[in-house]
Amino acid sequence: QQAPYWTHPQRMEKKLHAVPAGNTVKFRCPAAGNPTPTIRWLKDGQAFHGENRIGGIRLRHQHWSLVMESVVPSDRGTYTCLVENAVGSIRYNYLLDVLERSPHRPILQAGLPANTTAVVGSDVELLCKVYSDAQPHIQWLKHIVINGSSFGADGFPYVQVLKTADINSSEVEVLYLRNVSAEDAGEYTCLAGNSIGLSYQSAWLTVLPEEDPTWTAAAPEARYTD
């Protein structure tokens, strides 16, 4: 026999959930024990079954989860999962804050990504800082040339998607270019989209030929930097 224990504590590290009104919230407390424990939920210390909540709640015991759709300000509070069996019990608190700000298009920090100059063979990082109430979807694009032209007949540029992810992925806001060559030179765009709309900003990467070692030695102060 074994008292309940958390099977994936790393998935429970995010204690405070601050989400815009209208979003779906999911709290999980994956656990195990012998005998198999049961899970119940409390809101602000009281048994919570969601009967007074518009839209109710979804309890998925096999996933140890509580799901609330279309959260509203009255859903704010402390949500406790209580996991127990005959041997013992454990609990964990989640804090829910419901934000009432007007969701807007993603806002990109001015000046990012920044125009960059690099030498062939070096590594480049292009940075894009995004602020968004709604979870944004990020794409890094490179503007390309097709049949000698940068633009299609419709007047829009040809682009190639280099990287795509949601904002909660690690380092999604950085585009790494390793060991750059002359072909990597050109225009790069960071595009952020959410349910309201898209925003995007671009930067130019200039790639210079490898420095001649003899020339560099003669003029060390003339080295290129970003």
């Epitope: 979003n23 969701p103 806002i107 990109l108 920090q109 794409q139 829009f156 989209g193 898209l198 995007y200």
Partner: antibody, heavy 124, light 112 residues
Framework: EVQLLESGGGVVQPGRSLRLSCAAS????????MHWVRQAPGKGLEWVAV????????YYADSVKGRFTISRDNSKNTLSLQMNSLRVEDTAIYYC?????????????????WGQGTMVTVSS | DIVMTQTPLSLSVTPGQPASISCKSS???????????VYWYVQKSGQPPQLLIY???NRFSGVPDRFSGSGSRTDFTLKISRVEAEDVGVYYC?????????FGGGTKVEIK
């Protein structure tokens, strides 16, 4: 051809419920946010709700918050609006509108494609 | 919420003459990405709205070049250089920068 086709409208009594649907075709539905906009008879346009491409984000006008629920089924290319506790003032034509996509916007990033609308009448 | 105020309420125009519709927003619609998110629509009788202009001044595909959009931050204008009979309808401006998305009250354009 890009098309949105609403259905589910009708006459309903105050306090009752109705579910509207919008069938999308001619584009990759799962890559676009989708909106509902309504228009009361002889009046202007009022935005109702939006749902993100994957259904994870939903926003509502204050006038319908807590009563209406927007949802989508990307496997069926369908957008829905569940309308509960209907009021006389909800009487309107309800339009399904394509929102922002996920990729580079070759033109406007949404609000370019509208359905023909479905009429909802709330009356006792 | 951003309020969109449209003037005039109605407009009676002689075919071939210009027409101008004004729209004012209660907050700037100039976004950090440098674009101004005001859209213009026309709604003809019994039909859904049709997009004319997006992002302040870009004509939507298939829209005749007699339609143009201009303005900055909070003051916007839709111009029809030479009105034609088919242009009758109700014209709306819309802000597409934040939720709730909001529309102007509409301007009814008629032919004299």
């Amino acid at each position: 051809e890009v098309q949105l086709l609403e259905s589910g409208g009708g006459v309903v009594q105050p306090g009752r419920s109705l579910r509207l649907s919008c069938a999308a075709s001619g584009f990759t539905f799962s890559s676009y946010a989708m909106h509902w906009v309504r228009q009361a008879p002889g009046k202007g346009l009022e935005w109702v709700a939006v749902i993100s491409y994957d259904g994870s984000n939903k926003y509502y006008a204050d006038s319908v918050k807590g009563r209406f629920t927007i949802s989508r089924d990307n496997s069926k290319n369908t957008l829905s609006l569940q309308m509960n506790s209907l009021r006389v003032e909800d009487t309107a034509i309800y339009y399904c509108v394509r929102g922002a996509g996920q990729g580079y916007p070759y033109g406007p990033d949404g609000f370019d494609i509208w359905g023909q609308g479905t009429m909802v009448t709330v009356s006792s | 919420d951003i309020v969109m105020t449209q003037t005039p309420l109605s407009l009676s125009v002689t075919p071939g003459q210009p027409a101008s519709i004004s729209c004012k927003s209660s907050r700037s619609l100039l976004h950090s990405d440098g674009k101004t998110y005001v859209y213009w629509y026309v709604q003809k009788s019994g039909q859904p709205p049709q997009l004319l202009i997006y992002e302040l001044s870009n004509r939507f595909s298939g829209v005749p070049d007699r339609f143009s959009g201009s303005g900055s931050r909070t003051d916007f204008t839709l111009k029809i250089s030479r009105v034609e009979a088919e242009d009758v309808g109700v014209y709306y401006c819309m802000q597409y920068i934040e939720a709730p998305l909001t529309f102007g009250g509409g301007t009814k354009v008629e032919i004299k």
